[in-house]
Structures are given as C-alpha cells and as structure tokens.
Interface confidence: low
Amino acid sequence: APRGTQAEESPFVGNPGNITGARGLTGTLRCQLQVQGEPPEVHWLRDGQILELADSTQTQVPLGEDEQDDWIVVSQLRITSLQLSDTGQYQCLVFLGHQTFVSQPGYVGLEGLPYFLEEPEDRTVAANTPFNLSCQAQGPPEPVDLLWLQDAVPLATAPGHGPQRSLHVPGLNKTSSFSCEAHNAKGVTTSRTATITVLPQQPRNLHLVSRQPTELEVAWTPGLSGIYPLTHCTLQAVLSDDGMGIQAGEPDPPEEPLTSQASVPPHQLRLGSLHPHTPYHIRVACTSSQGPSSWTHWLPVETPEGVPLGPPENISATRNGSQAFVHWQEPRAPLQGTLLGYRLAYQGQDTPEVLMDIGLRQEVTLELQGDGSVSNLTVCVAAYTAAGDGPWSLPVPLEAWRPG
C-alpha cells in the first residue's frame, strides 16, 4: 500500500485493556503497534495528560531484515500498587512523521474494600474525661459508612449527629478497646483496635496541712480513677531554683527531685529531711493498676525558720575592774534561718541573772555594778532567729584581765 495512505491509518493493533481492582493491586496496560520504518517512542497518557514518569518498557521487534521493513512495538505500562491517583482513562500516543496517533482508551478503576486513611490510635485518658477518636476510610466504591465498636460491641452515630469520622466519647470508667468498621458495596474492612487506657484523674487541691523547719505535711484530693482503685500516690519535692525553671512552667525540675510514696487512703503525707527556711516546689500524682495520673502543677511551699541548732562558738570573757569584755563567733551548727542576733546572760554567785540583746554584734563590753567585786561571774551566749533562741552556750567564767 502507498505510504501516504498507510499514514492515515492508526498503527495500533493492540489497545490498553481495563483494570479494575482493589488498592495495592499490580497490573499492566499494553499497547501494540505495527509501523513501517524506524519505530517511534510510545508515550502514555492518563486523562489526556502525558505521564512523564511512567514505569513503562518498550519492546521493538523487526519483522524483516531491512530497516524500512515493518516493526512491531509493544509498550507496557506497569501499575505496581494501585492507588486512587492511578485511576482514569489511559491511552498510548505516538508521533509518526507529521501525524499524531492515539490508541483507543483503556480504563483503570479502583473498586474494593474500604481503605483506611486514619485509624483510631492507642491513648491514655483520665477517668470520666471526654475525648475524641478518629477514623477515616474511602472507596471506591463510595459511599463508605463507618461503624464504631467499643469492646467489640457496635455503637451507632446518627447521620448528621456528629461526623462519623470522629467518635466523641463522653468518658470511660474502665480501659476499653475501640475499632472502626468501614462498609461499602464491596464489603467490610476493620481498622486496628485502639486500646484506651483509663488512668486516674489528676489529683486536686494539693495543699499544706502543717509546717515544721525540716518537715512539711501535705494533703490532696484524689481524682476519679474509674473501676480501678488507687494503689498509691507519689509526691515529688524539689528545691526551688532562681525563679526560672519550674516557675516559668517547665515540666521537669532542674535537679533530681525528692520522691516519696504514700499509701492511700489517707491522701496525706509527711515529707521529712527538708532544709529549714527553704523554698520548695511540690507536686503529686496518683496511680492505679492502669498507670499514673498526670502530675499536678508544681505548688510553691516553704519550710519555716527553725532556731539555731548550736550555741555561738569560741566565747571568751575577760574582766578589768568594773568592766568585762566578751566576744564570740557565729555558731558552726546550722542556723535554720536568718540570724537576727545574740542574747547574752551573765550572773554572779549571789546576784540575779542579767539578760541582754546584743543584736548582730559579736562582742560586748559589760559595765559591772559596784566595784566589780561580784565573785564567780559567768557568761552564756545564744544565737536567735525569727523562730526563737538556739541553745545557750555553757557558762564561761570571767577571767581577770592580764595586761600584755
């Protein structure tokens, strides 16, 4: 036949077929053409658009020995894992001379069991606390109807009464499982089963019951814990830092907290071995067989001042006539607060005790009554804080002053 006439005819002798299947299916579309002369490159179209990155292979078989003889060309387009984006009308396209030829169309359709775009996730929730679960599925075929199951028992959500995709659970009192069934004309797909673990609610009203310099007694109100009794509560105390960190809302303390466990009830705990006159932050969480609640917010507390734990050190008292000179050093033992001053008491053998508040000085000159003939004078010194006096020193006898 003359070339001119031949060019008018479609060179395609095989057109793409139809593929309809479920997601993930692997399939191949084929085009076959017979041409005279040099075989052309076969392009694939989807819905009229050239596929630039098509996974296609082209096989060319000459039907004669001469270059100008006919060739059979087979182009195969492989669809490795069928997705919604693969669906549409497929055609082959070739440029021959000054003409463009397009094959008859083949169709790729997705039709199978529903496919989950989103499935319910495992999570923990506080007892009796509302939460939402999500599930989303698509076909085709559409429509896809969702059915929620709680502990394998179906729940219903009315059309137009809250989206099927989101299940609002007003609260749970026991650990439960949730899954979602997606129904379409092809059948049913079941999602993963999400375990919703019911933890105790965060305790409330953490407060101080009593304070001592090295001890704080605290109490709190437990939250609901569903059907699971609380096994214990855990209290953490941490030394407050420079005002950043915890107070700025950081979730974790800057250093290792002091942790104590309380049997419950009662929901109360005595925290000992604390530093006096020191700011702390405390928090509490309660635990059931299902796990711990969330921690309460950090509560700032402070131990009160205590009295100094020891007397002033190195007291010396010397006498010179009707005057006595007494000096001492700060107690080595912990002050348990802010040192406000010292008290001094002196007494003769047959005279009443004289008590003096010296303030923060560490020395004092005493004016003794009369000619200073009072015998066996002794001096005692104590340090004090806002909480009161520390222990008195042992009596120190006044020694006569020796010059030089």
Epitope: P154, L155, A156, A158, H161, H183, V188
Partner: antibody
Framework: EVNLVESGGGVVKPGASLKLSCEAS????????MSWVRQTSDKRLEWVAS????????YYLDNVKGRFIISRENAKNTLYLQMSSLKSEDTALFYC?????????????WGQGSSVTVSS | VIVMTQSHKFMSTSVGDRVSITCKAS??????VAWYQQKPGQSPKLLIY???TRHTGVPDRFTGSGSGTDYSLTISNVQTEDLAFYYC?????????FGAGTKLELK
C-alpha cells in the same frame, strides 16, 4: 417490592431443634444486614439475632447465645435461624426483618412471621 | 442492657386529635431510636428511625423527636387507621431492645 417469607416453624418438645428460613426478594440481599425478632403472646417484641450483609458478623441476644445460630446464603437470598435446646420460653412468633440502609439495627421490612411452640 | 420504657400501656384519643407517645431509654442512645406500628394480625412496620427520620411512605402526620434518653412519637390529626400498637426500639447497640408497647385506642 421487598418481600420476606418465613418458614420452618412448628410445635416441638423442650430440648428439640428447629430451623427457620426466610426467603427474601425484591432487593439485593447481600447488601443488607438481616435480623430475627420474636413476639411473645403478651405482644412484647424481643430481638434475637442479627447478621451483616456478607455474613461475616453476627450478634445474638445473651439467652440464645450457644443455642441459636443465625446464618445466610446470599446466593439463595435466604436467611436462617438454627435453634437447638429449645425451651418453653422460646415459644413465640419469629419474624425475619431487613436492616435499614442507614442502620441495619433498625428494621425497615418484616416478614409475616413463623410460629414456634415449645411444649411438652 | 439498655432498657426502653414506654410508661403508657394504653392511650386514648379521638379522630383528629394530636397524641404523643413517649419512650425513655435507661442511658443516652444518641438518637438511635426507631418507632414501629403494629396492627392486629400484621407484622410491625417501621415508621421512624434515627429518632426523627421518616421511613419511605410514612405519612407526615407521624413525627419523631427526642435526644439523650427521652423520645416521643407524635401523631397529629389521628385517623382511625392509626389505632394500633406502637413500639419504640433502640438501634444504638446490641442487644437491641424494644419498649413494651403502647396501644392507641379511641376514647
């Protein structure tokens, strides 16, 4: 037109077995969930069992679990209820019902019923 | 098990009246309530599902309403053919449960 016809009822002694059938027509049977519901002489309705369109999921009333089996043969458009270890309290009119598209736990079409009497 | 309680076993009405039949669920059934009508010697017929959705072919004088635990079926302009038993049912979860029924009769 949706049509459901039950058969297989009768009078049996306690402990006996009976199989009810329900032939469906007028709709694509495999697209719908189906249920059995019974009505006692005091006019009370009691749900007995349900089955999904494909037959893969079944649900039962607690006091029939282990004694009754709901099944379906989609190729024959037929629903079944196999009842064994029958008790006098199973005496009732048994209805076959189609589940509505919007919720197959709501029943949009019912058969005329098949009577089951369990008596010694 | 969700218990459906129809507090009135009988309700008297006159032709042309408006009557409401009530049903109370023992827990929230999120509007998954159906209403059925049954006449003597006949099988039940679905009137309403999802609390307020009228089934195909049901006259619009039948209206369902309610949410949470309280539901009602209202028949406005009662006709003689409406004299029957009415049952509520929860289609929220298994076991599916019905109310004991309310008989609508003429005064």
């Amino acid at each position: 037109e949706v049509n459901l016809v039950e058969s297989g009822g009768g009078v049996v002694k306690p402990g006996a077995s009976l199989k009810l059938s329900c032939e469906a027509s007028g709709f694509t049977f495999s697209n719908y969930g189906m249920s059995w519901v019974r009505q006692t002489s005091d006019k009370r309705l009691e749900w007995v069992a349900s089955i999904s369109g494909g037959g893969g999921r079944t649900y039962y009333l607690d006091n029939v679990k282990g004694r009754f089996i709901i099944s379906r043969e989609n190729a024959k458009n037929t629903l079944y209820l196999q009842m064994s270890s029958l008790k006098s309290e199973d005496t009732a009119l048994f209805y076959c019902a189609r589940g509505a598209r919007a919720s197959y736990f709501a029943m949009d079409y019912w058969g005329q019923g098949s009577s089951v009497t369990v008596s010694s | 098990v969700i218990v459906m309680t129809q507090s009135h076993k009988f309700m008297s009405t006159s032709v042309g009246d408006r009557v409401s039949i009530t049903c109370k669920a023992s827990q929230d059934v999120t509007t998954a309530v159906a209403w059925y009508q049954q006449k003597p010697g006949q099988s039940p017929k679905l009137l309403i599902y999802w609390a307020s959705t009228r089934h195909t072919g049901v006259p619009d004088r039948f209206t369902g309403s309610g949410s949470g635990t309280d539901y009602s079926l209202t028949i406005s302009n009662v006709q003689t053919e409406d004299l029957a038993f009415y049952y509520c049912q929860q289609h929220f979860t298994t076991p599916l449960t019905f109310g004991a029924g309310t008989k609508l009769e003429l005064k």
